[in-house]
């Protein structure tokens, strides 16, 4: 039975040209995390494999940095980066947990962090 929950940074906003940390945290389970995949819509941005470390998509290697932890840092943001991001936690024995973050990249300096929320 899957007992864990994923806490994410929720709905967030950031300024064009700036950077943002996408963060998920898996709690309430003793399952072993084997791999975390970070996806933007249907595109794979990065993988963090428990044994073999971080792997970044060649399309994003100049703008994506691994961490902190299992999170992902997006740099040199553009308005095209606005959209949904998913952290997919592959675990044993539980299976797969998915967290969702919505990022809005703003032209002006009115960017604020949204509230944190949980996805079971």
């Amino acid at each position: 039975m899957m007992t864990g929950t994923i806490e994410t940074t929720g709905n967030i906003s950031a300024e064009k040209g700036g950077s943002i940390i996408l963060q998920c945290h898996l709690s309430s389970t003793t399952a072993q995390v084997t791999q975390v995949n970070w996806e933007q819509q249907d595109q794979l941005l990065a993988i963090c494999n428990a044994d073999l470390g971080w792997h970044i998509s060649p399309s994003f290697k100049d703008r994506v940095a691994p961490g902190p932890g299992l999170g992902l840092t997006l740099q040199s943001l553009t308005v095209n980066d606005t959209g949904e991001y998913f952290c997919i936690y592959h675990t044993y024995p539980d299976g797969t947990y998915t967290g969702r973050i919505f990022l809005e990249v703003l032209e002006s300096s009115v960017a604020e962090h949204g509230a944190r929320f949980q996805i079971p």
């Epitope: 084997t34 794979l44 993988i47 792997h55």
Partner: antibody, heavy 117, light 106 residues
Framework: EVQLQQSGPELQRPGASVKLSCKAS????????IYWLKQRPKQSLEIIGR????????YFVDKFKNRATLTTNTSSNTAYMQLSSLTSEDTAIYFC??????????WGQGVMVTASS | NIHLTQSPSLLSASVGDRVTLSCKGS??????LVWYQQKLGEAPKLLIY???NLQSGIPSRFSGSGSGTDYTLTISSLQPEDAATYFC????????FGSGTKLEIK
């Protein structure tokens, strides 16, 4: 043209060590991780580990953590794998491969290692 | 980690045939699937990445398809030089390879 040139075949006694080399050319050596993989007849390819030539950081699957050593020489664009305490189970073809993001795009030609008395 | 099963393990076909090779995952592979060709005594060569993208320089008779757990490599018109072993590889959960399909020319 990207190329990975591996050293020649090895015959070693059980219990001995072997050191294999993989010379890279045709790209910037420090920009891609090098993986080492093992292939035995009628079995799936198996990952041994990874090294980042940029900083020398290594990663291993559990099975090889205590027996494999990965190093690089960035001045000669060469990666090395040393495998110790050889047994007959280590008789296999070993490949080095470059990873581009999430998959291996160029491979060495492979080197046959035989552990036999 | 995901286990990949390839079928058949051995396939014999004639020049000009349309050939289909299968790769099935023990879990969802999420289209993060790659196909390699390995000729006897040679290194594997990248054919298809991300399920259906043809690697540069690979003939257009090779194509890939699939989703979820089930993936296919198709050779539309088999050529003599296609005799080889074909491996699938996934990176959705762990980095694992199938055990291969050996393709022989009749």
């Amino acid at each position: 043209e990207v190329q990975l040139q591996q050293s020649g075949p090895e015959l070693q006694r059980p219990g001995a060590s072997v050191k294999l080399s993989c010379k890279a050319s045709g790209y910037t050596f420090t920009e891609h991780s090098i993986y080492w993989l093992k292939q035995r007849p009628k079995q799936s390819l198996e990952i041994i580990g990874r090294i980042d030539p940029k900083n020398g950081r290594t990663y291993f699957v559990d099975k090889f953590k205590n027996r494999a050593t990965l190093t690089t020489n960035t001045s000669s664009n060469t990666a090395y794998m040393q495998l110790s305490s050889l047994t007959s189970e280590d008789t296999a073809i070993y490949f080095c491969a470059r990873i581009d993001g999430f998959y291996f795009d160029f491979w060495g030609q492979g080197v046959m290692v035989t552990a036999s008395s | 980690n995901i286990h990949l099963t390839q079928s058949p393990s051995l396939l014999s076909a004639s020049v000009g045939d349309r050939v289909t090779l299968s790769c099935k995952g023990s879990q969802n592979v999420n289209k993060y699937l790659v196909w390699y060709q390995q000729k006897l005594g040679e290194a594997p060569k990248l054919l298809i990445y991300s399920t259906d993208n043809l690697q540069s320089g690979i003939p257009s008779r090779f194509s890939g398809s699939g989703s979820g757990t089930d993936y296919t490599l198709t050779i539309s018109s088999l050529q003599p030089e296609d005799a080889a072993t074909y491996f699938c590889y996934q990176y959705n959960n762990g980095f694992t390879f199938g055990s291969g399909t050996k393709l022989e020319i009749k």
